[in-house]
Interface confidence: medium
Amino acid sequence: SSSPTSSASSFSSSAPFLASAVSAQPPLPDQCPALCECSEAARTVKCVNRNLTEVPTDLPAYVRNLFLTGNQLAVLPAGAFARRPPLAELAALNLSGSRLDEVRAGAFEHLPSLRQLDLSHNPLADLSPFAFSGSNASVSAPSPLVELILNHIVPPEDERQNRSFEGMVVAALLAGRALQGLRRLELASNHFLYLPRDVLAQLPSLRHLDLSNNSLVSLTYVSFRNLTHLESLHLEDNALKVLHNGTLAELQGLPHIRVFLDNNPWVCDCHMADMVTWLKETEVVQGKDRLTCAYPEKMRNRVLLELNSADLDCDPILPPSLQTS
């Protein structure tokens, strides 16, 4: 990703206490959970690589940045961070690499200031549709989330629950239209074969979308038209063969966009002509001079920008009676 790293930040707000929050006695002001390191000055708690199996109950109320990385949490239940008084200042929550395989509905409820959430590198076989919205209402209260990092959350093949992994993730992103304010979404390294057609239209605030290192073959049914604020679109290391006219026109129409297309297996035949013409004219593609053909064999490693229409032919398809073995 070309933008600054999605590290937990000190961004926060104050918020009213939530009477419905749960959990034990409020922690003492200077209390720090066992196996954690706390800095009140930095408003940061780090419980890193400690093989924790659940979220500590006695998190200090001042926490703004919470790192729970490298643990063995397995399941994040509803209200996993609900406390009395609530963690009203918690703005950045990093749960990456903590062996989570299930995130239940309402797992992040009662975190009124949560702006950044990183669930990367967890094998999420079961991500509830209401993990982020917290309720099954058709329109939920807006989530405060602005940045959602879901890189490499695909579980091993044998742990998937006989359903589309793409569909499961998208259901969680769209439930209750709670993530209308989401500005950064990272979905890299998830073996996505396709992007459900309605997902982007319902995330109109996106500025940064990272779909790199997936297995996307085509963007034909994906519309970028509504994403008028999109600044970066990462599509490196996918299985894209060609971008068609409709996609090219939509990308060109986005006022702030930068698109990253490196390391895709571009097929340089007659269907590539429009894309090559567009590449020569556009300024939205970063590193466009690095894009090369993968197929057909005779075109391998040719630079797309150096192709002309004579190079881009389609072998005629012979009628069955004339085909040779």
Epitope: P4, T5, S10, V146, H256
Partner: antibody, heavy 119, light 106 residues
Framework: EVQLQQSGPELVKPGASVKISCKAS????????MHWVKQSHVKSLEWIGR????????TYNQDFKDKASLTVDKSSSTASMELHSLTSEDSAVYYC?????????????WGQGTLVTVS | FVMTQTPKFLLASAGDRVTISCKAS??????VGWYQQKPGQSPKLLIY???NRYTGVPDRFIGSGYGTDFTFTISTVQAEDLAVYFC?????????FGSGTKLEIK
């Protein structure tokens, strides 16, 4: 503690250039955009642009595209802005400002400002 | 996006409730913030995303609004609130500010 320490006031002649700096400390310098803002009596606060210290990528307000150049020196955690072809209209206080979420432009931290006088 | 801020000046006594308005030329969702700039100082972030108080900001500072109309209220003015207040949109680059409201205390 996050701190942005700007260079001192500058008195420059019309047509000249000036480079002002902003030394950052107390956070991961390459992790967040650095923004620059102009404050003058004429136009209040104006956003000039931002730079990504991670890779040097810049985004400018078109009104300042030919006026300002933003750079960073990662080794010293310093952001700089050079102003070109100065006129009296460029006399102002210039601030570096930090947003602590990379997708937003709420400026939670500001430098103390650098006064540039063109005369 | 033009942010039109009114009034330019406000005169209030300690204990008063004051309100500042900011109108965007087009919808900016809830992407508006408010800053306070005391004499001789840099601006300070008070409110972001229209209604969220930044860390450490007293709860007498209140923001509201959505779309094109935004309001900033100081529920009980105190002497130390003497400052210029600015709105800002963070909806789309270039990010733009209102012209400011100078609050003076009687």
């Amino acid at each position: 503690e996050v701190q942005l320490q700007q260079s001192g006031p500058e008195l420059v002649k019309p047509g000249a250039s000036v480079k002002i700096s902003c030394k950052a400390s107390g956070y991961s310098f390459t992790g967040y955009y650095m923004h620059w803002v102009k404050q003058s009596h004429v136009k209040s606060l104006e956003w000039i642009g931002r730079i990504n210290p991670y890779n040097g990528a810049t985004t400018y307000n078109q009104d300042f595209k030919d006026k300002a150049s933003l750079t960073v020196d990662k080794s010293s955690s310093t952001a700089s802005m050079e102003l070109h072809s100065l006129t009296s209209e460029d006399s102002a206080v210039y601030y570096c400002a930090l947003s602590t979420m990379i997708t937003t432009a709420w400026f939670a931290y500001w430098g103390q400002g650098t006064l540039v006088t063109v005369s | 996006f033009v942010m039109t801020q009114t009034p330019k000046f406000l005169l209030a006594s300690a204990g008063d409730r004051v309100t500042i308005s900011c109108k965007a030329s087009q919808s900016v969702s809830n992407d508006v913030g408010w800053y306070q700039q005391k004499p001789g100082q840099s601006p300070k972030l008070l409110i972001y995303f229209a209604s969220n108080r930044y860390t450490g900001v007293p709860d007498r500072f209140i923001g509201s609004g959505y779309g094109t109309d935004f309001t900033f209220t100081i529920s009980t003015v105190q002497a130390e609130d003497l400052a210029v207040y600015f709105c800002q949109q963070d909806y789309s680059s270039p990010f733009t500010f209102g012209s400011g409201t100078k609050l003076e205390i009687k």
